[in-house]
């Protein structure tokens, strides 16, 4: 069947980098200028990508393969092929409709993206807080207060104020 | 496909506790909150309140601080809610839903089929 | 208490114009994003705007979002209105990036 159609369709023999032309009897021309056809037998060639703007060239177009673009520095990538750049943001800071904000109290961010997220819950594995969080880091678990030997002691951290509603540590 | 799929419908003793679960796939559960919220019959949508699956940290409205538990199982991909000492006001559809991690302040992208639970004597 | 207050119900014939408002009681309608979701009997919401003015894929060019700071309210505002419009809508923003607020919904009905 693959043969058969081969025979009665001759653009399927127009490699990737160029498309089937109808105007000139169906032969293979090379993509124009700033164009690309990644498969074979293809009847046109799409456009390529540019990168304008925030966005920054990580690879030039070529006739068989788009380009592909990153952010500039400051930004970072979004959703599949980098189709956004957001702003980065400095640790211990979220992104919002405002720019970057600190994170609430009870939580942290520990990278230039992201949003923040709560601090560890030590308790639900029976421990308790060793080192407390802050914006920018997790609080650090430590033995279970009965694993304690005697005179030892673990940092309690300080009740969350401003922030309702986040479980206690 | 991301899809978040819960547990079937309850019926409950005034309190009593429910524990409704929010099985998660097609994506890193670990890395996304999952929030609660309901809706009691006829009424509009409430905040219970959210988890970080990632490392089991949480946040409750205070309505519900003291009466609703979440935790989330990483190995099965799957947040729970426990609701205790019901009432009849609890009586609604609970949901779970995820946030993206792009903002703050962003939509909840992805909600599960909601769970009705009824308090009823 | 940061309160987000929508009329009960709306009501408009086929093929006009309808818009829900979104009122911020107190702060500022642009310090957080506004989302909105539909919501029709038996199902869970499905986002219709987000980010107050982005349509997700799927959603027909009808919809759309806007801010209104002057009224410290947000709209969602659907042309060319279809039967299938008819459901209860949400608006949804934040108090903090912890605690999301809820309007208390507007139910359309498409006449």
């Known amino acids: 069947f693959e043969r058969t159609r081969s025979l009665q369709d001759p653009c399927s023999n127009c490699p990737a980098g160029t498309f089937c032309d109808n105007n000139r009897n169906q032969i293979c021309s090379p993509c124009p200028p700033n164009s690309f056809s990644s498969a074979g037998g293809q009847r046109t060639c799409d456009i390529c990508r540019q990168c304008k703007g925030v966005f920054r060239t990580r690879k030039e177009c070529s006739s068989t393969s788009n380009a592909e673009c990153d952010c500039t520095p400051g930004f970072h990538c979004l959703g599949a092929g980098c189709s956004m750049c957001e702003q980065d943001c400095k640790q211990g800071q979220e992104l919002t409709k405002k720019g970057c904000k600190d994170c609430c109290f009870g939580t942290f961010n520990d990278q230039k993206r992201g949003i923040c997220r709560p601090w560890t819950n030590c308790s639900l594995d029976g421990k308790s807080v060793l080192v407390n969080g802050t914006k920018e880091r997790d609080v650090v678990c430590g033995p279970s207060p009965a694993d304690l030997s005697p005179g030892a002691s673990s940092v309690t951290p300080p009740a969350p104020a401003r922030e309702p509603g986040h479980s206690p540590q | 496909e991301v899809q978040l799929v819960q547990s079937g419908a309850e019926v409950k003793k005034p309190g009593s506790s429910v524990k409704v679960s929010c099985k998660a796939s097609g994506y890193t559960f670990t890395s996304y909150y999952i929030y609660w919220v309901r809706q009691a019959p006829g009424q509009g949508l409430e905040w219970i309140g959210n988890i970080w699956p990632g490392n089991g940290g949480t946040f409750y409205g205070e309505k519900f601080m003291g009466r609703a538990t979440f935790t989330a199982d990483t190995s099965t991909s799957t947040a729970y809610m426990e609701l205790s000492s019901l009432r009849s006001e609890d009586t609604a559809v609970y949901y779970c839903?995820?946030?993206?991690?792009?903002?703050?302040?962003?939509?909840?992208?992805?909600w599960g089929q909601g769970t009705l639970v009824t308090v009823s004597s | 208490n940061v309160m987000l207050t929508q009329p009960h119900s709306v009501s408009e014939s086929p093929g006009k114009t309808v818009t829900i408002s979104c009122k911020l009681n107190?702060?500022?309608?642009?310090?957080?994003?506004v989302h909105w979701y539909q919501q029709r009997p038996g199902s869970s919401p499905t986002t219709m705007i987000y980010r107050d003015d982005k349509r997700p894929d799927g959603v027909p060019d009808r919809f759309s979002g806007s801010i209104d700071s002057s009224s410290n309210s947000a709209s969602l505002t659907i042309s060319g209105l279809k039967t299938e419009d008819e459901a209860d809508y949400y608006c949804?923003?934040?108090?903090?990036?912890?605690?999301?607020?809820f309007g208390g919904g507007t139910k359309l009905t498409v006449l």
């Open positions: 949804h923003s934040y108090d903090s990036t912890i605690t999301p607020v």
């Open positions: 107190s702060g500022n309608i642009g310090s957080y994003y």
């Open positions: 839903a995820r946030r993206p991690d792009y903002s703050g302040d962003d939509y909840f992208d992805y």
